[in-house]
Interface confidence: low
């Protein structure tokens, strides 16, 4: 594949990554799939600086990120280590709440209205953010 050196149209470049911010809502799995089809992944937040950047662009709206615990432990979709990595949960979160009555707990993480993170039911139709790194080998040519 080719090496991506600039961001696709309608994507925002920041610190050698490209970000795409949805304006509609999807369930977490559908959002994850959308990003993969764009040769990207749901956003992986690795620093307070990146957190502030994403927060600035999404505003006070529930928005999926690439963090889930559907198979047990919390995992970032790109393999970034969760335990040692950046975290920005709301104080009482994650709580894997079952009280919503929708079946199961809460296995997918999202940005809340104040930017801090919450775990929620993965089927909820939230906005999402895709991220792809510049200078990585892509399977497809850039979308120009």
């Amino acid at each position: 594949g080719s090496e991506r050196t600039c961001c696709p149209v309608n994507w925002v470049e920041h610190e050698r990554s490209c970000y795409w911010f949805s304006r509609s809502g999807k369930a977490w799995a559908d959002a994850d799939n959308y990003c993969r089809l764009e040769d990207a992944h749901l956003v992986v937040v690795t620093s307070w600086e990146e957190q502030k950047f994403v927060q600035h662009h999404i505003g006070p709206v529930n928005t999926w990120m690439g963090l889930h615990d559907q198979n047990g432990p919390w995992k970032w979709v790109d393999g970034t280590d969760y335990e040692t990595g950046f975290k920005n949960w709301r104080p009482e979160q994650p709580d894997d709440w079952y009280g919503h009555g929708l079946g199961g707990g809460e296995d997918c993480a999202h940005f809340t209205d104040d930017g801090r993170w919450n775990d929620d039911v993965c089927q909820r139709p939230y906005r999402w953010v895709c991220e792809t790194e510049l200078d990585k080998a892509s399977q497809e040519p850039p979308l120009l």
């Epitope: 529930n62 009482e92 709580d95 009280g99 209205d113």
Partner: antibody, heavy 114, light 107 residues
Framework: EVQLLESGGGLVQPGGSLRLSCAAS????????MSWVRQAPGKGLEWVST????????YYADSVKGRFTISRDNSKKTLYLQMNSLRAEDTAVYFC???????WGQGTLVTVSS | DIQMTQAPSSLSASVGDRVTITCRAS??????LVWFQQKPGKAPKSLIF???SLQSGVPSQFSGSGSGTDFTLTISILQPEDFATYYC?????????FGPGTKVDFK
Amino acid sequence: EVQLLESGGGLVQPGGSLRLSCAASGFTFSSYDMSWVRQAPGKGLEWVSTISGSGGITYYADSVKGRFTISRDNSKKTLYLQMNSLRAEDTAVYFCARDRGSVWGQGTLVTVSS
Amino acid sequence: DIQMTQAPSSLSASVGDRVTITCRASQDISNHLVWFQQKPGKAPKSLIFAASSLQSGVPSQFSGSGSGTDFTLTISILQPEDFATYYCHQYNSYPFTFGPGTKVDFK
């Protein structure tokens, strides 16, 4: 400042109806589940109903199911409780609360009596 | 439905005392428990959420512990403004339920 302000309480006859409102300010209303909790005079707290942030999911206590309807207007940042077929045992102060009780209104008194 | 019980139902204490209130759920509720304080004629106020996390702005003499079915609220050094009724509340599953309350009054 984060605030909830209830209104709409009053005296109503058994079998009558009343609609309570809860006006929210100081936070992104649509991001939070909202609940109604009531407290009969001299008694403890009783959960009544909860509605999801979008308004798409609602839950009710068995004691009010089929008689009360919770709703919200996110554009007006307002929560509602429509109470029909009121009974004497519905007499209470009704509080609206955000999320899991992190913010409460001051309450509004509903008295059901002939 | 999940039943919540509290002990004691009331207690008399003095300023400076250490006060402990227990709450028991009829089934496992993980850490999905809140403690509220209520004074006469006022709305409840959240003290502790997720069983052990202190609500913002609440003084540090309040602490919570427990998980599963057994929970404790501790006031390490009772202050004059702490005389009130305390309720536990489970939000693990609907219908949400409250404990019957514990009234803390002057000895």
